[in-house]
């Protein structure tokens, strides 16, 4: 209960903090526990106390171990233990889960992302913002005190973020880094009874004789990402697998985000060969989503050959 | 009309892979689409990703895509959710659901859930 993770990179600074906490005025004491050796408090030691922080500066990958602070006050004391990890700096740009602070969700109203940890640190403005390794650069991304914001979140924005600032200590300054997944949530997301787009119900479509035909269910289920939602096409209210006739297929085409948001999906008939039994046969487009089912109606006529004489 | 039987849930380590299954049985010519929902615990059930038969177009929730894969193998009436790169915000008991129509109102079937745990 009264442990805590920390983590941080070689050469970069890191700073902990007692998980157990007391009055300013309470002394704290940190030991490294494999050892029971105590951490000294002289700034100019690499590792050392500071009340409630225990300060790497930098860390490096032989720190790594389980420190012990013991808050005292003159009726109790209070241990608490910090597990520290100090990992190789990557090579490459991929940053490991282990090295993850904690997901942040945003949405199209609420756009911030904390750099974690940075109110451990004395650090000074300007604080760098990173995407998937990349400078965070435009007029949508605003590096504002601790955090960041992204005007207009867009799905797209969704990724890990890393800050990057200076920590300064006695005028000696050393680097931070720390990375965050962020997810887009779509506040405005629901779904609805489906709405066929396309065709109208009870449709005629005009076909060619031993031409091919394509006819297309177009069906809107909501905004946002859609789950268990469905278009399909039924020959005289069987289903196309079923109905054995190879010269019909039906194969799922676009699914489309129109402008206002909408979540659709669209499923191709094609009738290949029409032939004139084909005319006779009732044709029904279904959209279908736990909300219910919609379902249009279409036949098929003969389209009249064009009369080319002048 | 349709039972659902998931497997494939477990412990993993934070940046692990899992694979879950789920086979269905019963009236599956009536099944339109599948899908994963997950619950972790004092939260509500939330999507995680569906597929219908023809399977281009899977949908995914943001908090996994490009980290989970579904996919349906419909020979054997059984989808899949390929979890990479799992996150301790992962776990959460997964149940696989369907979009079930035979004529009337369109329902849901749901399995009874396997656990997935992601924790160092």
């Known amino acids: 209960k009264f442990s805590k993770q920390s983590w941080g990179l070689e050469n970069e600074a890191l700073i902990v903090r007692c998980p157990r906490q007391g009055k300013p005025s309470y002394t704290v004491d940190w030991y490294y526990s494999q050892t029971n050796k105590s951490i000294p408090t002289q700034e100019r030691n690499r590792v050392f106390a500071s009340g409630q922080l225990l300060k790497f500066l930098p860390a490096a990958v032989a720190d790594s171990g389980i420190y012990t602070c013991i808050v005292r006050s003159p009726t109790f004391n209070r241990t608490g233990y910090a597990n520290v990890t100090i990992y190789k700096k990557q090579s490459d740009c991929n940053v490991p889960d282990y090295l993850m602070y904690s997901t942040v969700s945003g949405s199209e109203k609420n756009s911030k992302i904390y750099c974690p940890t940075i109110d451990l640190y004395n650090w000074t403005a300007p604080l760098e913002w990173f995407k998937n390794c990349q400078a965070l650069q435009g007029s949508r991304y605003r590096a504002h005190k601790s955090f960041l914001v992204i005007d207009n979140v867009m799905t797209e924005d969704a990724g890990d973020y890393t800050c990057k600032f200076i920590h300064n200590e006695n005028g000696a300054n050393y680097s931070v880094t720390a990375t965050r997944s962020f997810t887009v949530k779509d506040e405005q997301g629901f779904s609805l009874f489906p709405v066929i787009g396309a065709p109208a119900q009870n449709e005629i479509k005009e076909v060619e004789i031993g031409k091919n035909a394509n006819l297309t269910c177009s069906a809107c289920f909501g905004k946002g990402t859609q789950f268990l939602a469905a278009v399909l096409w039924q020959l005289n209210g069987t289903k196309i697998t079923d109905f054995g006739e190879p010269r019909i297929q039906q194969e799922e085409g676009q699914n489309q985000s129109f402008s206002n948001g909408l979540a659709c999906l669209d499923m191709v008939l094609r009738i290949a060969d029409v032939k004139e039994e084909d005319l006779l046969l009732q044709y029904d487009c279904l959209a279908l989503n736990l909300h219910g089912l919609r379902r249009h109606t279409v036949r098929l006529s003969r389209k009249n050959p064009i009369d080319h004489h002048s | 009309e349709v039972q659902l039987v998931e497997s494939g849930g477990g412990l993993v380590q934070p940046g692990g892979s899992l694979r879950l299954s789920c086979a269905a049985s019963?009236?599956?010519?009536?099944?339109?689409?599948m899908g994963w929902f997950r619950q972790a615990p004092g939260k509500e059930r939330e999507p995680v990703a569906s597929?219908?038969?023809?399977?281009?177009?899977?949908a995914y929730a943001d908090s996994v895509k490009g980290r989970f894969t579904i996919s349906a193998d419909n020979s054997k009436n059984t989808a899949y959710l390929q979890m990479n790169s799992l996150k301790p915000e992962d776990t959460a008991v997964y149940y696989c659901?369907?979009?079930?129509?035979?004529?009337?109102?369109?329902?849901?079937?749901w399995g009874q859930g396997t656990l997935v745990t992601v924790s160092s």
């Open positions: 597929i219908t038969p023809g399977g281009r177009f899977p």
């Open positions: 019963g009236r599956t010519s009536n099944i339109y689409a």
């Open positions: 659901s369907t979009l079930y129509y035979s004529g009337l109102d369109p329902v849901d079937y």
